[in-house]
């Protein structure tokens, strides 16, 4: 189900990764320097902003992000 | 800089009703949800509720329901919970804090509420 | 609801010394735990969000850590003005629940 409308709850953050809000909605998510070799799997349909920097993801698969608009 | 101001005490009998008030100022009062929380005398604390000060949607803690009544005035940036029917057991500190996206990061001093004839 | 347990209730430890506060979920939260200081004037500040991350302002000495359910706040090196009482908070579904806190003391 769709998560409730609050303030009090924090968006999906994945494991490891740091995450801060950018306004009302969104999450600005911070996944640098983590030695990540694929994508975070549980990524906020609410990120506004993704650092993958300083990984070791080699390549993407075409729309690697289908949850985010 | 941001500020929740809250009135230090209240004394109020037992069976009457209460208006808590929570004055904002330091940043924009309909950016931000405004959070009440109860501490009761050597106690944790417990969420009551939460209100969206851009048009009064608001959350409540189904334990503080038919007891607590969160609302705003935008045009004074104040935030308001009625307690009503009140007994000894509300007699607490009521926190109201700020919060966006989870980051409940300002509180207020908290106001004491003693409910006594 | 989520229960939040603080096993420990008090804790004295000396000036300089490393401190632990633990926190555990009686479910899953998804690393969606916030750290609160509440110092003995009733004052409350956010130190920790997402389980690690350090609110701006926070002394680095703070540093948070966990998964799953269980997890801690370390104090690296206890100083003065640390001495008061530290919640965990849950922030993964309504309503959120604080853990009973931790009231830390100079030995």
């Known amino acids: 189900g769709s998560s409730p409308r609050s303030g009090v709850l924090l968006r999906g953050c994945p494991t490891h990764c740091h995450c801060e809000p950018d306004g009302r909605m969104l999450l600005r998510v911070d996944c640098s320097d983590l030695g990540l070799s694929e994508l975070p799997s549980n990524l906020s349909v609410f990120t506004s902003y993704l650092d993958l920097s300083m990984n070791n993801i080699s390549q993407l698969l075409p729309n690697p992000l289908p949850s985010l608009r | 800089q941001v500020q929740l101001q809250q009135p230090g005490a209240e004394l109020v009998k037992p069976g009457a009703s209460v208006k808590l008030s929570c004055k904002a100022s330091?940043?924009?009062?309909?950016?931000?949800?405004m959070q009440w929380v109860k501490q009761r005398p050597g106690q944790g604390l417990e969420w009551i509720g939460e209100?969206?000060?851009?048009?009064?949607?608001?959350n409540y803690n189904q334990k503080f329901k038919g007891k607590a009544t969160l609302t705003v005035d935008t045009s004074s940036s104040t935030a308001y919970m009625q307690l009503s029917s009140l007994t000894s057991e509300d007699s607490a500190v009521y926190y109201c804090?700020?919060?966006?996206?989870?980051?409940?990061?300002?509180w207020g001093q908290g106001t004491t509420l003693t409910v006594s004839s | 609801d989520i229960q939040m347990t603080q096993t420990t209730s008090s804790l004295s430890a000396s000036l300089g010394d490393r401190v632990t506060i633990s926190c555990r979920a009686s479910?899953?939260?998804?690393?969606?735990l916030n750290w609160y200081q509440q110092k003995p004037d009733g004052t409350v500040k956010l130190l920790i969000s997402?389980?690690?991350r350090l609110q701006s302002g926070v002394p680095s000495r703070f540093s948070g850590s966990g998964s799953g359910t269980d997890y801690s706040l370390t104090i690296s090196n206890l100083e003065e003005e640390d001495i008061a009482t530290y919640f965990c908070?849950?922030?993964?579904?309504?309503?959120?629940?604080f853990g009973g806190g931790t009231k830390l003391e100079v030995r």
């Open positions: 804090a700020r919060s966006l996206s989870g980051y409940v990061d300002y």
């Open positions: 209100i969206d000060p851009s048009d009064s949607y608001s």
């Open positions: 997402y389980r690690s």
């Open positions: 479910q899953d939260i998804s690393n969606r």
């Open positions: 908070q849950q922030g993964n579904t309504l309503p959120p629940t």
């Open positions: 330091g940043y924009t009062f309909t950016s931000y949800w």
